[in-house]
């Protein structure tokens, strides 16, 4: 479900002769006027809509937080795309902030995955090869992590 699907400014288009099942909707990059007759453009760099809609207002563009870089700006049809700065990542269960990546693995573990903007370094036990999920108590070695490239829209 997108942010737009949950938007509160839904309206019922006024009853009138309909030319198609979707009359009363406006294209991406627009919202509908209060009387339901016109489509009004979102304001470039300020707000957006991503789907055909009957929103009374476009959705406000996200501003990237400090600790994030802007991968692509907000357009009238797409929200800003923000990414954690190098050396930090955003977890699925705590998407509101970027957290620092660990610099190395605990004793008895080896690094098998680098720090990326969406994941911490990945460590596995030397012998068993099983992943380690807890916090690192003591660090055996310091490994500089390298950032990844894929982007994800800010939430």
């Amino acid at each position: 479900i997108t942010q737009q699907d949950l938007a509160p400014q839904q309206r019922v288009a006024p009853q009138q002769k309909r030319s198609s099942p979707s009359e009363g909707l406006c294209p991406p990059g627009h919202h509908i006027s209060e009387d339901g007759r016109d489509c009004i453009s979102c304001k470039y760099g300020q707000d957006y809509s991503t789907h055909w809609n009957d929103l009374l207002f476009c959705l406000r563009c996200t501003r990237c937080d400090s600790g994030e870089v802007e991968l692509s700006p907000c357009t009238t049809t797409r929200n800003t795309v923000c990414q954690c700065e190098e050396g930090t990542f955003r977890e699925e269960d705590s998407p509101e902030m970027c957290r620092k990546c660990r610099t190395g693995c605990p004793r008895g573990m080896v690094k098998v995955g680098d720090c990326t903007p969406w994941s911490d370094i990945e460590c596995v036990h030397k012998e068993s090869g099983t992943k380690h999920s807890g916090e690192a108590p003591a660090v055996e070695e310091t490994v500089t992590s390298s950032p990844g490239t894929p982007a994800s829209p800010c939430s």
Partner: antibody, heavy 119, light 107 residues
């Protein structure tokens, strides 16, 4: 490359109807909105309405709403504009044009179809 | 409906001149304005959208500016092939409307 090819010139009598076609090629038909814009001789441009093949959305300029009908045949990637109850002031070149699902400017245009209304 | 008033209606200039065409909207249209070039017997061609963004393949001698109600199309150095009629269009609110056009000719 993107092409919008329109049907040929028409001469009609007042009160009659005309149906102009616009065949699209060179892009995915269901991803762009197609519009009709007209231009009377020596005059400016006037937006008439749109059709979006992706969800069959149609929107008309209120000025033409009672007389214009826009339809499409997705199997041939063709959009049609029918204008009824023709009068002499409907004499114009009728263009189809497309725009992305976003800002309402037109990046490609058909070659135009001259419709002459004369008794 | 929003009225788009273009000026001048006719403009005569020499090759190499800097040419400016203005367009005034009857109400605020933010930056939702496009400019088109139309040569006789041909369909319009998109030059500028969002008031100042040049369309793909448009020479950089064409530039646009403005926001709110006042907009400008500038040709920095007029070329013979620029002889045409130019139209502004607001794409802020339906029905989308066009200016009356500016016919540009060589002195």
């Amino acid at each position: 490359q993107v092409q919008l090819v329109q049907s040929g010139a028409e001469v009609k009598k007042p009160g009659a109807s005309v149906k102009v076609s616009c065949k699209a090629s060179g892009y995915t038909f269901t991803e762009y909105i197609l519009h009709w814009v007209r231009q009377a001789p020596g005059q400016g441009l006037e937006w008439m309405g749109w059709f979006y093949p992706g969800n069959n959305n149609i929107k008309y300029n209120e000025k033409f709403k009672d007389r214009v009908t826009i339809t499409a045949d997705k199997s041939t990637s063709t959009v049609y504009m029918e204008l009824s109850s023709l009068r002499s002031e409907d004499t114009a070149v009728y263009y189809c044009a497309r725009h992305e699902q976003g800002p309402g400017y037109f990046d490609y245009w058909g070659q135009g179809t001259l419709v002459t209304v004369s008794s | 409906d929003i009225q788009m008033t273009q000026s001048p209606s006719f403009l005569s200039a020499s090759v190499g001149d800097r040419v400016t065409i203005t367009c005034r909207a009857s109400q605020d249209v933010n930056t939702a304005v496009a400019w088109y070039q139309q040569k006789p017997g041909k369909a319009p061609k998109l030059l500028i959208y969002w008031a100042s963004t040049r369309h793909t393949g448009v020479p950089d001698r064409f530039s646009g500016s403005g926001s709110g109600t006042d907009f400008t199309l500038t040709i920095s150095s007029l070329q013979p092939e620029d002889i045409a009629t130019y139209y502004c269009q607001q794409h802020y609110i339906t029905p989308w409307t066009f200016g009356g056009g500016t016919k540009l000719e060589i002195k």
